[in-house]
């Protein structure tokens, strides 16, 4: 029997200080270039080596960025999201959603890590 793949979703506030090469990560997404079908959210697509995000260590590829300095990133064009980051200042507060893949046991078996029940 195959195991079931579930996702554990957590949120975290990450405060970054803009470095010499900016925030040190890439983004994809937006209403005009959805990364996931029917989801116009902004996702982290690359963490640059030795950049601000890499040195902080908490931001991961695949994280969804929910807000920047308290400003919601919902329903923004990609370029508008980029501009928000561009104008975010020296100290940048990110609200991010981590999505951790969890491999559960065979279907029908409740593993120790299964939160149901």
């Amino acid at each position: 029997m195959n195991g079931r793949v579930d996702y554990l979703v957590t949120e975290e506030e990450i405060n970054l200080t803009r470095g010499p090469s900016g925030l040190g990560f890439n983004i994809v997404g937006g209403t005009d270039q959805q990364y996931v079908s029917n989801d116009s959210g902004i996702y982290v697509s690359r963490i640059k080596e030795n950049g601000a995000a890499a040195l902080d260590g908490r931001l991961q590829e695949g994280d969804k960025i929910l807000s920047v300095n308290g400003q919601d990133l919902k329903n923004l064009l990609h370029q508008d999201a980029v501009d928000l980051f561009r104008n975010a200042g020296y100290a940048v507060s990110l609200r991010v959603q981590h999505r951790l893949q969890v491999q559960n046991g065979p279907i029908g078996h409740r593993g120790e890590g299964d939160p149901s029940g």
């Epitope: 890439n26 994809v28 990364y35 640059k48 990609h78």
Partner: nanobody, 122 residues
Framework: DVQLVESGGGLVQAGGSLRLSCAAS????????MGWYRQAPGKQRELVAS???????NYADSVKGRFTISRDNAKNAVYLQMNSLKPEDTAVYYC?????????????????WGRGTQVTVS
């Protein structure tokens, strides 16, 4: 660095089909957008179709219903199935891999290009 190698171009009659393939190697990352662009003589390069590693697709209006983009994440490959080809589809087709917009000092798109494959529809 990233390398993109296209194949599958050629000469085909109007109404015919071709399938383009592009294999990516190097540090392409798990979150990216792979796509096909084309450039006809004397014209600007234009997006044909793209597909993200998250599965979202995007097509130019001129190819909707005729072209289908797909990808194999395990093989780091992207494919373009082109049906009902028209003479106006004649162009050099380029594979593109984009890793998003870099939030650095430049705020530039972080992307890579193949060398192109010629498609001629007679």
């Amino acid at each position: 660095d990233v390398q993109l190698v296209e194949s599958g171009g050629g000469l085909v009659q109007a109404g015919g089909s071709l399938r383009l393939s592009c294999a990516a190697s190097g540090s392409i990352g798990s979150i990216n957008i792979m796509g096909w662009y084309r450039q006809a003589p004397g014209k600007q390069r234009e997006l044909v179709a793209s597909i993200t590693s998250g599965g979202a697709t995007n097509y130019a209006d001129s190819v909707k219903g005729r072209f289908t983009i797909s990808r194999d994440n395990a093989k780091n490959a992207v494919y373009l199935q082109m049906n009902s080809l028209k003479p106006e589809d004649t162009a050099v087709y380029y594979c593109n891999l984009a890793r998003g917009t870099h939030l650095g000092d430049s705020f530039e798109r972080d992307d890579y290009w193949g060398r192109g494959t010629q498609v001629t529809v007679s």
